[in-house]
Interface confidence: medium
Amino acid sequence: FDLVDYEEVLGKLGIYDADGDGDFDVDDAKVLLGLKERSTSEPAVPPEEAEPHTEPEEQVPVEAEPQNIEDEAKEQIQSLLHEMVHAEHVEGEDLQQEDGPTGEPQQEDDEFLMATDVDDRFETLEPEVSHEETEHSYHVEETVSQDCNQDMEEMMSEQENPDSSEPVVEDERLHHDTDDVTYQVYEEQAVYEPLENEGIEITEVTAPPEDNPVEDSQVIVEEVSIFPVEEQQEVPPETNRKTDDPEQKAKVKKKKPKLLNKFDKTIKAELDAAEKLRKRGKIEEAVNAFKELVRKYPQSPRARYGKAQCEDDLAEKRRSNEVLRGAIETYQEVASLPDVPADLLKLSLKRRSDRQQFLGHMRGSLLTLQRLVQLFPNDTSLKNDLGVGYLLIGDNDNAKKVYEEVLSVTPNDGFAKVHYGFILKAQNKIAESIPYLKEGIESGDPGTDDGRFYFHLGDAMQRVGNKEAYKWYELGHKRGHFASVWQRSLYNVNGLKAQPWWTPKETGYTELVKSLERNWKLIRDEGLAVMDKAKGLFLPEDENLREKGDWSQFTLWQQGRRNENACKGAPKTCTLLEKFPETTGCRRGQIKYSIMHPGTHVWPHTGPTNCRLRMHLGLVIPKEGCKIRCANETKTWEEGKVLIFDDSFEHEVWQDASSFRLIFIVDVWHPELTPQQRRSLPAI
């Protein structure tokens, strides 16, 4: 919709909804940018170290900074802030109206693109959660740890997260499934999730079972890479690779942030005492201590910032969205106080932006990032964050401008390069995207070691006939983004048997295969009838997977949901399939007819998940010219026969016959997934 239907939500779901957002129907819980339409909760545990590291290269050397920052720059900052503070003041409010909360609606609902509100993006699932599924996430490494000051002015990046120099925002178990059509379109390509939330400690994160009944509170986690959970850290691997680089070290150690103004230095002992409580994890006591300091010293930026951090910590501890909204508001208050040290201002607004993203307040986060860039125009990393902010709301054009600007000033910025390449690829500027993606990944800069960049670099290279593609897939595999060079899906459950081609016996779904093969003519005839009478039900593939040709699909089920309208066109086929929950209940797949016309070539591509296997039943197969390659083995279809392959492996299709090819595609759960996993895995 365009809006959440709160009448449907309130009173029916309880405070914490297993799928963590606001969908109208639990079985229809689809996530858009981490949100759905119905529930009043959203999973996502904020990270342990939540505060962004300051951008060292941006800070003025300590010696150079006036004691109380009462120079022109400070005045500019203050006037800019006062101008902008009011524009965003309401964001933290949580207005409860008759038909539900509207203060800071969270995201677009995937049906009507209406604003939605979600009461809690912190998951309250039971602790016994299995952590088996790996999900590729989008990282932008965190730049300042939440404990950004040990002795108020110590450079925390040296203590806690020595090598980061970009803000981390990592997609946090929020799956963003678009509407059905879009998913039909996306289903054969890895789905790229937004950089919504901050880097999390994977071992603590739970994934929402997006499509399941609310009662299913145990969930499978999709981890950030294919390594075992224990190996996951908040600090992404590329930052570690950079530690030996003296330049990088120099960058990080350039300057300690100045967090105290003249007045705060006079109350440093009190601030230290309160901070010590927070550092020791005595959050409630720390909150009270900082509240008291704010009461006593309402103009103290550092006291206010401490209060914000405590609220932030408390929100994490209680998994409370309401508390986090308060923290976001308090970070804002820091910025509106007089005489705020530039470093503290930056930390506070960066953290605010990050937490806004965590809550799905993408637009609000973007406004905060815009303010940051206005306040600190020379900080490249903030511009990079701003670019991501634009990407998160689908504004590729503005993101592109931002990265062009960054690259005009710092042509070797790897983060800007990969993102710029990413945007070019999205615009189908395949050849142009390659050098940016390649050089960006090669830079090793924080935020560049992301599976999607390898995925798209390889894909771009394949499309221009560059054999180097597999070198990058290999590297992506080595760095933990892909299960193997061939198997490059990004939503994976670890440990599932991985082979490109399967026999019916190996799947265990022999009854389904038999039924399909016995009834193939019935299935074929219904498909042909739809082609004749309601051709419009066959929707063209528009995911840019084709080099050339004509390929359309008519979908009966997707995300485990029957399309009633479609089933009117193929009623017997739908009835036949109802007996097989391994396919009708496969929320990570579809059941559909696929028609491909002569002269079609589908680029090598990879499906999004290893959780399904794909059956192809031949319905109308020309004598010659039609073939499918999965990994390094190529096969042909036969009428009335089922082929089974794992589409998380690279596959490619050719249709060089003289007439159309019609097949019936039936996705099934990977046989090794447990019933619990099948219930809990979020839909794709």
Partner: antibody, heavy 127, light 106 residues
Framework: QVQLVESEGGVVQPGRPLRLSCAAS????????MHWVRQAPGKGLEWVAV????????RYAGSVKGRFTISRDNSKNTLYLQMNSLRPEDTGVYYC????????????????????WGQGTTVTVSS | IVLTQSPATLSLPPRERATLSCGTS??????LAWYQQKPGRAPRVLTY???NRAAGTPARFSGSGSGTDFTPAISSLEPEDFAVYYC?????????FGPGTKVDIK
Amino acid sequence: QVQLVESEGGVVQPGRPLRLSCAASGFTFSSHAMHWVRQAPGKGLEWVAVVSHDGSRDRYAGSVKGRFTISRDNSKNTLYLQMNSLRPEDTGVYYCARVGRSSNWFSRYYYYGMDVWGQGTTVTVSS
Amino acid sequence: IVLTQSPATLSLPPRERATLSCGTSQNVSHYLAWYQQKPGRAPRVLTYDVANRAAGTPARFSGSGSGTDFTPAISSLEPEDFAVYYCQQRSNWPQAFGPGTKVDIK
């Protein structure tokens, strides 16, 4: 090019039904939620109803709830508004409008306003 | 959510700056769009989500505000800008338009 064309409206007596249609062309109709918006003579715009991209969900303004039904046929690229129990206050120009959306690998999609409108069709409810 | 727009009519000469106003009875955050309608024509979207210009919207149009108060502006009125302007919220059901502000030539 991208366009929406409403069917002819007409004059109808109070209490009688009328069905409006809106033919879409130049874009993937089945990917977009669609709205009906109306405008009484000399008055402002009034939102009427919306239907999801696949026709599975709809919402209505209080003034038309229970009387009007929005639907779509994606195979025909057509949006409908079935108006029953018409009243004189339903008189006006009825517009169909598309919900703009964009997608990319980061955000999947994002709202762009009601970005394409039909030319409007006049409905007059009078005895 | 009730939307109010002021003034009902704004009479200005060309090349002058026009500032409109839209208020909402509840916080709609940034979920507010502006539409322009000329006599006998369908509306067209100018900005969505407060400040984002739609494709084809000239740079002289800008939007600002958040929560309950919004003020779009036209930096320098062109002859083609004289029209009725509507704000619309999508923060909660039912979606609603404001009553409109007519910008006419002084």
